[in-house]
Amino acid sequence: SAPGEDEECGRVRDFVAKLANNTHQHVFDDLRGSVSLSWVGDSTGVILVLTTFHVPLVIMTFGQSKLYRSEDYGKNFKDITDLINNTFIRTEFGMAIGPENSGKVVLTAEVSGGSRGGRIFRSSDFAKNFVQTDLPFHPLTQMMYSPQNSDYLLALSTENGLWVSKNFGGKWEEIHKAVCLAKWGSDNTIFFTTYANGSCKADLGALELWRTSDLGKSFKTIGVKIYSFGLGGRFLFASVMADKDTTRRIHVSTDQGDTWSMAQLPSVGQEQFYSILAANDDMVFMHVDEPGDTGFGTIFTSDDRGIVYSKSLDRHLYTTTGGETDFTNVTSLRGVYITSVLSEDNSIQTMITFDQGGRWTHLRKPENSECDATAKNKNECSLHIHASYSISQKLNVPMAPLSEPNAVGIVIAHGSVGDAISVMVPDVYISDDGGYSWTKMLEGPHYYTILDSGGIIVAIEHSSRPINVIKFSTDEGQCWQTYTFTRDPIYFTGLASEPGARSMNISIWGFTESFLTSQWVSYTIDFKDILERNCEEKDYTIWLAHSTDPADYEDGCILGYKEQFLRLRKSSVCQNGRDYVVTKQPSICLCSLEDFLCDFGYYRPENDSKCVEQPELKGHDLEFCLYGREEHLTTNGYRKIPGDKCQGGVNPVREVKDLKKKCTSNFLSPEKQNSKSN
């Protein structure tokens, strides 16, 4: 029988009546065009919905937009279009929602062709009131909030000016011209690239990287010959053109650009790219594109300085710059990432790492699953996960993989079971242990979401026909109940739940179509009465993450420590609640050589855990710059993996080598950097 369909499933009693009392319909009295939805703040219940309708006329486009506000998680909406003077809002800028619980919202309006500047509507009270502000420029990008101070905004203009506001968009000042890319750093610092003569495109590779720490009063040039830059965790990266040719190389700084080191990564040519796949304060995953139009590259993982890189995964699927990659951080378990590789026969296979890129393996075949037509051996195959690439290829995949930090161990994804990703209609699979083991959760493609920190999973079948049924599970996807939320089926367009998976409300969005008209409609279902009581101590059980062999003393050790979690028992039907905090207990492991990566000039031969000196570097000057100047690099060949907390055990102490090196970087050394004031 299909997953969750057997009669032994733990049934939730009287759920139809409980859900019927908590199902709220809202019909939007405007025409169906596009709809965008934003949550304002955390646990506030405030949702803004912007509906837009375009009529392309011969000479111009006539547009109409409406703004709606809910303060009860979408159960009721109020038309607040009059608060923005019935102005047409530009959807390409979306709704710029302020960080944390600032309650700030910026909407960018459409203005007539001849106007001097753009127009925004600003709210700092969770969209209860808006203030209209006319801008002295036409915005090119959405307003960007400083992560540290939501009153500080920056924007680029259509004329490449960098504009800053210090009073939440009331007053704006152009702090620099000829700007290509700007980003907030930490402590209200702004980094941006600027061109000298031509344009952003023409000067690519000849840009300068600037920094201001005082919102434009003074500037410091921190890089030249810049192609691009990026921020990840505590690292600032710049790709810099080489002197001799058209290749470029990554440089990294951990002090906001004051000093730079050359990353020990391959240089790339004009048609190649670098991409930061993931970064935290410990390390970074970097993709380096292969030469030629291969559609793949190599993943490297960094040391704690962002300088030394270990090859992590070959033939990593990444189609083009800004294209598609399936790289996914499984946020429900530390150290776990999933991605796709392009094999020699051009089939796509899923790989998973449990130790932050140290080793990659195929996903274990789900229990009770048959291998599909892609499998050479019908008894041995793997699960392959559909992610961004499959979605871009218009396969029947409505959603990317889903995991939430507060729903420990749970990963939900579309997949197929075989030797590679299949173009057949996928099923939905779930893992409750962070990707080690999988089971089929639902037959066929579905939309899915996690509520109440994993206490409820909700799903809706992906169908071209109108739907009126929602499925839900209170036991991590083992058993499913179905609920008919409306008599009149709707054309489904999306599931919306508050980010963070703490809510117990789900909104089903769609439209109804009649003979002459179609209207937006939403149904919000509150599951609070399904989970009638608050969870108690007896509802939780203890679980050891990353456990693969209990007989092994170091079972569960990943990056030098193991973690035990209190997890909700599958049979417990209760509320984790909005204030639920994951309870975990770490314990330190003994060190082994696996806890160390090879330092600069060293490598690990295949199937060996010892680091040995790279023969080609013996007695040679190294094309490597540390902190932008010539200096001696001393190393014993080992460096602890970033984030590794092991203690005792193996301590790879040996003779410290002195690697004499000549700095061959053409990048800025501190003495070449200059400062300017406005």
Partner: antibody, heavy 124, light 106 residues
Framework: QVQLVQSGAEVKKPGSSVKVSCKAS????????ISWVRQAPGQGLEWMGG????????NYAQKFQGRVTITADESTSTAYMELSSLRSEDTAVYYC?????????????????WGQGTTVTVSS | DIQMTQSPSTLSASVGDRVTITCRAS??????LAWYQQKPGKAPKLLIY???SLESGVPSRFSGSGSGTEFTLTISSLQPDDFATYYC????????FGGGTKVEIK
């Protein structure tokens, strides 16, 4: 082969406490939960509680909450069960048992290794 | 706590008989059920875990089935060594045992 060896029989007065030990040998003590189960004469099995040596996470059956304390000493691979405010109904054979484990869940796979049992007699 | 009801409490059978013992949980426990055999004066011995998985070293005449709330232990052909008391135990809530089933010689 894993073995659990329990301390010897005890005779106790009502109102007093008893502490029974359970020493593991021949396996990884720290990675498994240890449960304590008792059996009164002619009666069935009754779970009292358990402990995971790593982190010392203990949990108890509601019936014994407040009266039983389960501890573990990783360095000696020994688990302890202390039962206080003894009454005559506490006369039983007390077993420690290792919870088998195939995944990260500690208590879900049955008790695969048992101690020989410790007889506790409560009598005035 | 979850209650476990075992039946019958006593069962008389002969060598070679097929014996079935049932266990009912007061609420769904998925497949988290174990079966034990206990002989007088001895500690219990694990036979089955996760409702139907046979513990290593246990003869294949023992089998378990069921999920949710209804479970059975079957001895396909009773042997002289099998006369004992059998307990079921749920592991999804705080652990609880069934009352036991004594299998005696007819």
């Amino acid at each position: 082969q894993v073995q659990l060896v329990q301390s010897g029989a005890e005779v106790k007065k009502p109102g007093s406490s008893v502490k029974v030990s359970c020493k593991a040998s021949g396996g990884t003590f720290r990675n498994y939960a240890i449960s304590w189960v008792r059996q009164a004469p002619g009666q069935g099995l009754e779970w009292m509680g358990g402990i995971i040596p790593i982190g010392g996470w203990a949990n108890y059956a509601q019936k014994f909450q407040g009266r039983v304390t389960i501890t573990a000493d990783e360095s000696t691979s020994t688990a302890y069960m202390e039962l206080s405010s003894l009454r005559s109904e506490d006369t039983a054979v007390y077993y420690c048992a290792r919870q088998g484990r195939k995944t990260g869940y500690y208590y879900y796979y049955g008790m695969d290794v048992w101690g020989q049992g410790t007889t506790v007699t409560v009598s005035s | 706590d979850i209650q476990m009801t075992q039946s019958p409490s006593t069962l008389s059978a002969s060598v070679g008989d097929r014996v079935t013992i049932t266990c009912r949980a007061s609420q769904s426990i998925s497949s988290w059920l174990a079966w034990y055999q206990q002989k007088p004066g001895k500690a219990p011995k694990l036979l089955i875990y996760k409702a139907s998985s046979l513990e290593s070293g246990v003869p294949s005449r023992f089998s378990g089935s069921g999920s949710g709330t209804e479970f059975t232990l079957t001895i396909s052909s009773l042997q002289p060594d099998d006369f004992a008391t059998y307990y079921c135990q749920q592991a999804d809530g705080h652990i609880t045992f069934g009352g036991g089933t004594k299998v005696e010689i007819k």
